[in-house]
């Protein structure tokens, strides 16, 4: 039986979760983030094969997001535009995961510090992403049944020299459904 991923100690070391990232903001947008076959990223009202995502910890508090169906990594340009890439560029495709008190998560580009915003449905990946919702509710997907794609970066150990070696300090200490088994 797999160890549930609710422990903050499992936030690093290659921990893998399958999730749908759902968002509902004040502008009547309700959508699941999906990474499409052509590399575009958008929102779908319903859960779909393209919206099932694999979230894998790279180091404390930092994850990569992989579209399970399309085998594309979620990445972000310096202007905030999202795209799905076949190649994992750690500087474009690594996101800091911040847990909020209400169960939602916020994701920020580790390199640029920009929050992950869901682009409009018709926004091509090469256009700057319009401002969309930045809070995502990670909904459990199916447990990983297929062997995971080869890791690009070896998981890094906790930064023992840091005052926050496990990246525990964030907007809150609240437990997110992202870590529900």
């Amino acid at each position: 039986h797999p160890i549930p991923d609710s422990s903050p100690l499992l936030q690093f070391g290659g921990q893998v979760r399958q999730r749908y990232l759902y968002t509902d903001d004040a502008q009547q947008t309700e959508a699941h983030l999906e990474i499409r076959e052509d590399g575009t990223v958008g929102g779908a009202a319903d859960q779909s094969p393209e919206s099932l995502l694999q979230l894998k910890a790279l180091k404390p508090g930092v994850i990569q997001i992989l579209g399970v169906k399309t085998s594309r990594f979620l990445c972000q340009r310096p202007d905030g535009a999202l795209y799905g890439s076949l190649h994992f560029d750690p500087e474009a495709c690594s996101f800091r995961e911040l847990l909020l008190e209400d169960g939602y998560n916020v994701y920020q580009s580790e390199a640029h510090g920009l929050p992950l915003h869901l682009p409009g449905n018709k926004s091509p990946h090469r256009d700057p992403a319009p401002r969309g919702p930045a809070r995502f509710l990670p909904l459990p997907g199916l447990p990983p049944a297929l062997p995971e794609p080869p890791g690009i970066l070896a998981p890094q150990p906790p930064d023992v020299g840091s005052s926050d070696p496990l990246s525990m300090v964030g907007p809150s200490q609240g437990r997110s459904p992202s870590y529900a088994s």
Epitope: D38, G39, S71, R72, C75, R77, P78, D79, Y83, G84, S85, L86, H87, F88, D89, P90, E91, A92, A111, H125, R126, P149, P150, G151, I152
Partner: antibody, heavy 119, light 110 residues
Framework: EVKLVESGGDLVKPGGSLKLSCAAS????????MSWVRQTPDKRLEWVAT????????YYPDSVKGRFTISRDNAKNTLYLQMSSLRSEDTAMYYC????????????WGTGTTVTVSS | QIVLTQSPAIMSAPLGERVTMTCTAS???????LHWYQQKPGSSPKVWIY???NLASGVPTRFSGSGSGTSYSLTISSMEAEDAATYYC???????????FGGGTKLEIK
């Protein structure tokens, strides 16, 4: 217009060093992975080096690992290739190439610069 | 490391003829990772077909690409003079990241 222009190619003796530059224009340089690809005199294409968008991650084939170093200056929109311990088999036309954002094939190529290694 | 072998190395075809060239991988390659480039003498390579079947911008519709696993091909439905060039297949491997080219097929007019 999206453009890549290489420079720095020269005739150099075996064991020597050379630094190539590639000036990029017409696109947001810092958004793209970049590579060097060379074409040998027999017209074969060989991937030489790749660098991530921010420059922190680099990749090389075994044939140049430890001898070549790829780097970039996003503020100057310039890509570099430092070559050392050059061998005769490094003689080639060197192209700077941009990676497509989503599929990572080489979607834009420069005009190339010639490196000849000979005594 | 995957090796890409292109055949034939050189071929000639009369104008109007259907042309097919192949690219064989030493082990299976995802169709998303297989691309083709065209190069004419004195010019840099240009992406011609990406992800096995998708024509790059400006590529005539007489070109097509197909394949899966270890066998891929580029086809010209009706050879035209401007198609005379060398075509290279190219593969991306995800982990560790590497990029490999085939030896090329030189297409001439008969």
């Amino acid at each position: 217009e999206v453009k890549l222009v290489e420079s720095g190619g020269d005739l150099v003796k075996p064991g020597g060093s050379l630094k190539l530059s590639c000036a990029a224009s017409g696109f947001t340089f810092s958004s793209y992975g970049m590579s060097w690809v060379r074409q040998t005199p027999d017209k074969r294409l060989e991937w030489v080096a790749t660098i991530s968008t921010g420059g922190g991650y680099t990749y090389y084939p075994d044939s140049v690992k430890g001898r070549f170093t790829i780097s970039r200056d996003n503020a100057k929109n310039t890509l570099y290739l430092q070559m050392s311990s050059l061998r005769s088999e490094d003689t080639a036309m060197y192209y700077c190439a941009r990676h497509d954002l989503v599929d990572w094939y080489f979607d834009v190529w420069g005009t190339g610069t010639t490196v000849t290694v000979s005594s | 490391q995957i090796v890409l072998t292109q055949s034939p190395a050189i071929m000639s075809a009369p104008l109007g003829e259907r042309v097919t060239m192949t690219c064989t991988a030493s082990s299976s390659v995802s169709s998303s990772y297989l691309h083709w480039y065209q190069q004419k003498p004195g010019s840099s390579p240009k992406v011609w077909i990406y992800r096995t079947t998708n024509l790059a911008s400006g590529v005539p519709t007489r070109f097509s690409g197909s394949g899966s696993g270890t066998s891929y091909s580029l086809t010209i439905s009706s050879m035209e003079a401007e198609d005379a060039a060398t075509y290279y297949c190219h593969q991306y491997h995800r982990s560790p990241p590497t990029w490999t080219f085939g030896g090329g097929t030189k297409l001439e007019i008969k």
